[in-house]
């Protein structure tokens, strides 16, 4: 069976990385496992990552925004960023607002990677299904 | 042969959904059928599904944004929004502007579904080839 | 073998076509070559192409920013722009900002087939690996 | 800069017909409605049909189907319409105004014309 | 057709006080996206100019002391502080279907 992995918002998200809805709704996971924010890779190989981050707010004060895909593995000490967006001076002072951030590549993930998304201000992140999602396939 | 649709922008079409380009160009069509304004998947599995759209106009009014990829089915009574861009306070007033939403995802769809995308307001759209587009491919 | 490459931002770029890092970190390139800022196909068929490039500035005078991806074939006369993204009027006035441009479609390249990304102000590109990069894979 | 230029004044005769003219210019022409508004004298705005200059597709108010036409030429910019077997009734400032096509707004105005009728 | 009612007809306002226009509509206007409601300022002699369009937003070039709001059918125009040059008259208009309907129309005048 085709691995792959559709994920979409979970508004109910505290802390970093993001958390998904895996489950209800258009959600995909065939393949991949999901835990504790991340997908679990488990067949070494060539995948399509991607992810869109809606963010959003009343009052536009320009805080500058990141939209990280990251990778870890416990062979590694640290988090590999694999794709990134930032934002800054994105909206005029005080008015309501609202952008989106794109992320999408291949990369050649190994068995027992595990794929995060990060965001700098999680206050701002709206969760609606069709606006803020993560997933992936095996080519 | 493989399932896959590259669609681009269809300058004279008033209406909504957008129309587009299934002819000339660097358009693509196989093993999707075109319907006014429609990709009609005709074997079900899995899909990338993926849209850009430019946006641009004279003198910035912050006009609130938004590009969907929705998907109809006879079975089912209403659309589902399988993707979506909103932007708000995006450029300086007053001032030309333009911007980009791209959308793109892997969706698990049925055959008969018609999938079509969305503006929300056509007279800000540009059409050129390479600049607003439409398409998909099974995986 | 699977035809793929990613390739990242290399900052010694200094003309157009803009230049890319083949080698290393998370660069990928597998039955595809890299000659001189370009992906050489050199198998007929279908690609997913994509590419993303992160601009950004101590002090914004909304400089207008184009990004394309673009085709050239010497059996051609003229580049074909395959993908490209626009942005005008995007920041405040004398701010620090930053912005990226994505885009991915699919299209039917031919054996030889030469694809390149420019942009219209290289001094506004950050060539970091995980924000500006250009890839595509065969269907 | 978006500009609406209307034709002048027009005095005519009851059961006759008029022809008003709209030349817009500081925009692309054949992306967004033009939209034509009636104003009778110490009235509100009523709104008569839009055209699309894109493809010549049109709607109508069901109060002016039969009374008024849109046409456009989109060599030169001009939106027209024209007004048939007119009445002292007819008789208002008539307006074009640019329309964005989803939002249905009128963010660009003509002057007006005013219309006449009486014999 | 949608009937926009406008009420007051007529209000006069002191300088740097508020103006406060409202405009019922007899279904509501509203998406899960959008209230499409625009507010448009007449005076004698000159055409409509557009001033908050999607009932909320301020058109380019138009003072930050006009402001929109509402949702469904009911709607509010508030012009704060008044000026001398606010004297107009204000229509309320919908685009939620065909055909486009205004409201009647508030009179404006400075105390």
């Known amino acids: 069976l085709r691995k792959v992995a559709h994920l979409t918002g979970k508004s109910n998200s505290r802390s970093m990385p993001l958390e998904w809805e895996d489950t209800y709704g258009i959600v995909l996971l065939s393949g991949v496992k999901y835990k504790k924010g991340g997908l679990v890779i488990n067949e070494t190989g060539l995948y399509f990552v991607y992810s869109k981050v809606y963010f959003r707010g009343q009052s536009c004060n320009n805080l500058p925004l990141s939209h990280k895909v990251y990778m870890r593995n416990s062979k590694y000490p640290q988090d590999l960023v694999m794709m990134e967006g930032k934002m800054m001076s994105y909206c005029t002072t005080g008015q309501m607002w609202a952008r989106s951030s794109y992320l999408g590549a291949v990369f050649n993930l190994t068995s027992a990677d595990h794929l995060y998304v990060n965001v700098s201000e999680l206050s701002l992140v709206n969760f609606e299904e069709s606006q803020t999602f993560f997933g992936l396939y095996k080519l | 042969l493989r399932k896959v649709a590259h669609l681009t922008g269809k300058s004279n079409s008033r209406s909504m959904p957008l129309e587009w380009e299934d002819t000339y160009g660097i358009v693509l069509l196989s093993g999707v059928k075109y319907k006014k304004g429609g990709l009609v998947i005709n074997e079900t599995g899995l899909y990338f599904v993926y849209s850009k759209v430019y946006f641009r106009g004279q003198s910035c009014n912050n006009l609130p944004l938004s590009h969907k990829v929705y998907m109809r089915n006879s079975k089912y009574p209403q659309d589902l929004v399988m993707m979506e861009g909103k932007m708000m306070s995006y450029c300086t007033t007053g001032q030309m502007w333009a911007r980009s939403s791209y959308l793109g995802a892997v969706f698990n769809l049925t055959s008969a579904d018609h999938l079509y995308v969305n503006v929300s307001e056509l007279s800000l759209v540009n059409f050129e080839e390479s600049q607003t587009f439409f398409g998909l491919y099974k995986l | 073998l699977r035809k793929v490459a990613h390739l990242t931002g290399k900052s010694n770029s200094r003309s157009m076509p803009l230049e890319w890092e083949d080698t290393y970190g998370i660069v990928l390139l597998s039955g595809v070559k890299y000659k001189k800022g370009g992906l050489v196909i050199n198998e007929t068929g279908l690609y997913f192409v994509y590419s993303k490039v992160y601009f950004r500035g101590q002090s914004c005078n909304n400089l207008p920013l184009s990004h394309k991806v673009y085709m050239r074939n010497s059996k051609y006369p003229q580049d074909l722009v395959m993908m490209e993204g626009k942005m005008m009027s995007y920041c405040t006035t004398g701010q620090m900002w930053a912005r990226s441009s994505y885009l991915g479609a699919v299209f039917n390249l031919t054996s030889a087939d030469h694809l390149y990304v420019n942009v219209s102000e290289l001094s506004l590109v950050n060539f970091e690996e995980s924000q500006t990069f250009f890839g595509l894979y065969k269907l | 800069e978006v500009q609406l230029q209307q034709s002048g004044v027009e005095l005519v005769k009851p059961g006759a017909s008029v022809k008003l003219s709209c030349k817009a210019s500081g925009y692309t022409f054949t992306r967004f409605d033009i939209s034509w508004v009636r104003q009778r004298p110490e009235q509100g705005l009523e709104w008569i049909g839009w055209?699309?200059?894109?493809?010549?597709?049109?709607q109508y108010n069901e109060n002016f189907k039969g009374k008024a036409t849109l046409t456009t030429d989109k060599s030169s910019g001009t939106a027209y319409m024209q007004l048939n077997r007119l009445t002292s009734e007819d008789s208002a400032v008539y307006f074009c105004?640019?329309?964005?096509?989803?939002?249905?707004?009128?963010?660009?105005w003509g002057q007006g014309t005013t219309l006449t009728v009486s014999s | 057709d949608i009937v926009m009612t406008q009420s007051p007809a007529s209000l006069a306002v002191s300088l740097g006080q508020r103006a406060t226009i409202s405009c019922r509509a007899s279904k509501s206007v509203s998406t899960s996206d959008f209230s499409y409601i625009h507010w448009y300022q007449q005076k004698p002699g000159q055409p409509p100019k557009l001033l908050i369009f999607l009932a909320s937003h301020l058109e380019s070039g138009v003072p930050a002391r006009f402001s929109g709001s509402g949702s469904g059918t009911d709607f509010t125009l508030n012009i704060h502080p008044v000026e001398e040059e606010d004297a107009a008259t204000y229509y309320c208009?919908?685009?939620?279907?065909?055909?486009?309907?205004f409201g009647g129309g508030t009179k404006l005048e400075i105390k």
């Open positions: 105004a640019r329309s964005l096509i989803s939002t249905a707004m009128f963010d660009h």
């Open positions: 055209i699309f200059p894109g493809d010549g597709s049109s």
């Open positions: 208009q919908h685009s939620r279907e065909l055909p486009r309907t």
